[in-house]
Interface confidence: low
């Protein structure tokens, strides 16, 4: 059951001091902003008991798990039904408190009645201020039954409800005819969905035998323990002044739980705290009585004494509810009342026992809800106890329920039931949501609805490029925070999946469904401009460009150069794949062509603005290469070149160009024009002695033609260093074109 308690402070001398507090012991209760836990709600329910309107009540939240209602100005504000709602999802639970006016004509002998299906319920309204009129009984605000005023028995009006069924549950009231509804006696009837001691669909399962006034929940078989008791079967008393499923809450004020009414989830209802009784929970239990409403009797044996909060306190050598068990009888020690495991895990469960004779391994066994008995695989024997360890086979959902550890020796036997909750690891029902995207990152909300059980302890986000077979990248994130996936590729689809885990071994759920998230690719905004270009041949063009300087990283992957040949209607595109490049050599162009040239930055598949265009005219293609080039040294500074004219000339040659280079030298070559195109020999002068030279030549008509073969020749020795090579008869106007 959900750990939810509604406390009413019944010190009623001053309504302004009256308050209601709802306390949740659930993990993450009331966090509201957290997607895993809705907030606690505490309100007056005016649907059945309507009171005159007054100033609004004040709601104050104290931390994440407590909410208090104050601001009652007059006694009539208090009369009626109040409810607290807490817990998440399927565990969302409503706890109800019914408040009666102490000055009413009729008062309930007992406000909350919890009965089993098929039982007879008897509601008893005690006459407080007599009126000689009929009494009207109502159920959930609707007329139900009338009793004549003289039908009172022993100053009480009784309503008998035979063979009650769950739909009979609700708020009942007894009111004198024509009296104010605020003077009514209000009751709450809770009808369990099963007969006594049974629970579950079809009521086929047996309740664990709740102790100390605990009530077996008809849906899950758990004991809803009275305030001040804990354990699977409510077998353990809390310290005085404590309440909550684990005794974790403390009653406020110096007088402990005096004057407080405690309301718990159905089918428990409401009662005083342990050790107190009376309509305002201000009377201590009479000797020999203990527990909530002092309903329990101690009946202590063997010298035990009765404590009104916890029951029998046994002398040494004895234990048990009534101190009826000798310590010679074996006893299960410190068994947790509730254990939680994840589905399909194989946990180890320990069970410790003491006694005389001492329990050994074979004397301790573990029984599952289906009756299967497990024997321990190992035992640790210590001076004061034996701890048996059980290896549990792979858990299935049907293993949820009450398990039992049993010890048997010749001194007797003991058993302890405990609840095992098998939890289903959470599986996302939806894919994560994309919040924002950039070219290299995605911001994702990992919060999704899920099947299975919470709470969610970790969220893993798995991602990899779409259609990739590479390993998934994984990031572990906080369930409540958005996640940024970084260092991604621009304009790339990523498959993204969520994996949820709950606490404990084997708490990782299956991966959720994938979703496709695509990184962005911002459009490049910078416009380059062409710095310059020069022709490196009839079909080669070197181009250079610049970009404006802007702060921040450059948004771009490279440049696209476009050459438009308007005559032929053709476009040539050249991709420069480095965004740092500022120059490119374009080859394989058509000689003699007029091109329009521009450059633009690109990012992924997006193009930025093009530069202002440039117009470039490539020279036409030249004649074929001269044939049979030959070199012959004439002296230490002269070499003669001879050749034959090219064949199939498209027109008259305007000149020849000779290229001279020192063999193995690192310097640039020299170009010398031969302006008499009819000649087939020339002498290159001004060379260095004993030096090896390389020569080649080409003809020019409108444009330069193809190079001839390269020839080698060395000058003769013993000469002086020359100033540089010149052509035979034109040394004064040699044409050097570098």
């Amino acid at each position: 059951a959900v750990d939810l308690t509604l406390l009413a402070n019944l010190r009623l001398t001053d309504p302004q001091r009256f308050f209601l507090t709802c306390v949740s012991g659930e993990a993450g209760a009331g966090r509201g902003s957290d997607a895993w836990g809705p907030p606690l709600l505490l309100e007056k329910d005016d649907r059945i008991v309507r009171t005159p309107p007054g100033p609004p009540l004040r709601l104050a939240r104290n931390g994440s798990h407590q909410v208090t209602l104050r601001g009652f100005s007059k006694p009539s504000d208090l009369v009626g039904v109040f409810s607290c709602v807490g817990g998440a999802g399927a565990r969302r639970t409503r706890v109800i408190y019914v408040h009666n006016s102490p000055g009413a004509h009729l008062l309930p002998d007992k406000v909350t009645h919890t009965v089993n299906k098929g039982d007879t319920a008897v509601l008893s309204a005690r006459v407080h201020k007599e009126k000689q009129t009929d009494v009207i009984w109502k159920s959930n605000g609707s007329y139900f039954y009338t009793l004549d005023w003289h039908e009172a028995q022993d100053g009480r009006f009784l309503l008998q409800l035979p063979n009650v069924q769950p739909p009979s549950s609700g708020i009942y009231s007894a009111t004198y005819l024509e009296a104010s509804p605020l003077g009514s006696a209000f009751f709450r009837l809770i009808v369990r969905g099963c007969g006594a001691g049974r629970w579950g669909p079809g009521c086929t399962k047996e309740c664990p035998g709740c102790l100390h006034g605990g009530v077996c929940h008809d849906h899950d078989g758990e004991c809803v323990c009275p305030p001040g008791f804990t354990g699977t079967r409510c077998e353990q008393a809390c310290r005085e002044g404590r309440f909550g499923q684990s005794c974790q809450e403390q009653c406020p004020g110096i007088s402990g739980c005096r004057g407080l009414t405690f309301c718990l989830p159905d089918p428990y209802g409401c009662s005083c705290g342990s050790g107190w009784r009376g309509s305002q929970c201000q009377e201590a239990c009479a000797p020999g009585h203990f527990g909530a409403d002092c309903r329990l009797q101690c009946q202590c044996q063997n010298g035990g004494t009765c404590d009104r909060f916890s029951g029998c306190v046994c002398p040494s050598g004895w234990h048990g509810v009534h101190c009826e068990k000798s310590d010679r009888i074996p006893q299960i020690l410190n068994m947790a009342s509730e254990l939680e495991f994840n589905l399909e895990t194989m946990p180890r469960i320990n069970c410790a026992a003491a006694g005389n004779p001492f329990p050994v391994r074979g004397s301790i066994e573990l029984r599952k809800p289906d009756g299967t008995v497990l024997l321990s695989t190992k035992a640790i024997v210590e001076p004061e106890k034996t701890t048996a360890e059980f290896e549990v086979p792979r858990l299935v959902l049907a293993d949820s329920g009450f398990w039992e550890c049993r010890v048997s020796t010749s001194g007797g036997q003991d058993s302890r039931r405990f609840k095992v909750n098998v939890k289903v690891p959470p599986v996302p029902l939806a894919a994560p949501r994309l919040l924002t995207k950039q070219s290299r990152q995605l911001v994702v909300s990992p919060l999704v609805s899920f099947s299975g059980d919470g709470p969610i302890s970790t969220v893993r986000l798995h991602y990899r490029p779409q259609d990739s077979t590479m390993d998934w990248s994984t990031i572990v994130v906080d369930p409540s925070e958005n996640v940024t996936l970084m260092n991604l590729r621009p304009k790339t689809g990523y498959s993204v999946r969520v994996q949820l885990s709950r606490p404990g071994e084997g708490g990782e759920g299956a991966w959720g469904p994938p979703t496709l998230m695509t990184t962005d690719c911002p459009e490049p905004l910078l416009q380059p401009w062409l710095e310059g270009w020069h022709v490196e041949g009839t079909d080669r063009l070197r181009v250079s460009w610049s970009l404006p300087l802007v702060p921040g990283p450059l948004v771009g992957d490279g440049f696209l150069l476009r050459l438009w040949d308007g005559t032929r209607g053709q476009e040539r595109r050249e991709n420069v794949s480095s965004p740092q490049a500022r120059t490119a050599l374009l080859t394989g162009l058509t000689p003699g062509t007029h091109y329009q040239l521009d450059v633009q930055l690109y990012h992924c598949t997006l193009l930025g603005p093009a530069s202002p265009p440039a117009h470039v005219l490539l020279p036409p293609s030249g004649p074929p290469a001269p044939r049979h080039l030959h070199a012959q040294a004439l002296s230490d500074s002269e070499i003669q070149l001879t050749w034959k004219h090219p064949e199939a000339l498209p027109g008259p040659i305007s000149k020849y160009v000779v290229e001279v280079q020192v063999a193995g030298g690192a310097g640039d070559p020299l170009w010398i024009d031969v302006d008499r195109p009819e000649e087939t020999s020339t002498i290159i002068r001004g060379l260095n002695a004993s030096t090896r030279y390389l020569f080649r030549m080409r003809a020019s008509i409108q444009g330069l033609g193809d190079w001839s073969n390269t020839v080698e020749e060395s000058t003769l020795g013993n000469g002086l260093q020359a100033e540089g090579p010149v052509q035979e008869s034109r040394a004064a106007e040699e044409g050097l074109d570098q």
Partner: antibody, heavy 119, light 107 residues
Framework: EVQLLESGGGLVQPGGSLRLSCAAS????????MQWVRQAPGKGLEWVSV????????NYADSVKGRFTISRDNSKNTLYLQMNSLRAEDTATYYC????????????WGQGTMVTVSS | DIQMTQSPSSLSASVGDRVTITCWAS??????LAWYQQKPGKPPKLLIF???TLQGGVPSRFSGSGSGTEFTLTISGLQPEDFATYYC?????????FGDGTKVEIR
């Protein structure tokens, strides 16, 4: 191609049993919530049962609760429906269907298999 | 359990007509509703989920609207291939009940 293919239908006598199978292909079966839906001849659609990815969580329509069992074998990419104590009113075409990840809507359906309960 | 009621149970229409089918839920289901199309001898086909979101590959002439307890499927220009039976289904927790269907026939 994403596909679901049911099999195992046929004629059975009242009180008898039948096991339907649904073979999944073209998607990661172990990540999806799966359902059985049926349609009596000439009638509308009736949801029968659901099973969550790990196989640990199931739910049934009241009309089949206690008689039908849904299960799955993720290693075989197969969904099952074990039908016991069959009645004449169970006669229908049985479809298996996949649930969209972000809603409970059924986005992929099999072609269906006919179950006839008659003496 | 949530009951789903569809209206009309059948209707006759011509190609090009605008057709509206209404579905009511017995309690508030916010926008947890789907629409399916089924042709004889074939399995149903998902058209719309979350009351108004078109399933991928479904023509844009199909649209859904509504929230709470009343929902509408509209076909804004009936095509020959649209003559079929249409079902609504609530998605607001189990059991996921369907409406009884609306048969759209050729006039």
């Amino acid at each position: 191609e994403v596909q679901l293919l049911e099999s195992g239908g046929g004629l059975v006598q009242p009180g008898g049993s039948l096991r339907l199978s649904c073979a999944a292909s073209g998607f990661t079966f172990s990540n999806y919530v799966m359902q059985w839906v049926r349609q009596a001849p000439g009638k509308g659609l009736e949801w029968v049962s659901v099973i969550y990815p790990s196989g640990g969580m199931t739910n049934y329509a009241d009309s089949v609760k206690g008689r039908f069992t849904i299960s799955r074998d993720n290693s075989k990419n197969t969904l099952y429906l074990q039908m016991n104590s069959l009645r004449a009113e169970d006669t229908a075409t049985y479809y298996c269907a996949r649930i969209r990840g972000d809603t409970r809507a059924f986005d992929i359906w099999g072609q269906g298999t006919m179950v006839t309960v008659s003496s | 359990d949530i009951q789903m009621t569809q209206s009309p149970s059948s209707l006759s229409a011509s190609v090009g007509d605008r057709v509206t089918i209404t579905c009511w839920a017995s309690q508030d289901i916010r926008t947890s509703l789907a629409w399916y199309q089924q042709k004889p001898g074939k399995p149903p086909k998902l058209l719309i989920f979350a009351a108004s979101t078109l399933q991928g590959g479904v023509p844009s002439r199909f649209s859904g609207s509504g929230s709470g307890t009343e929902f509408t499927l509209t076909i804004s220009g009936l095509q020959p291939e649209d003559f079929a039976t249409y079902y609504c289904q609530h998605l607001n927790g189990y059991p996921l009940t369907f409406g009884d269907g609306t048969k759209v026939e050729i006039r």
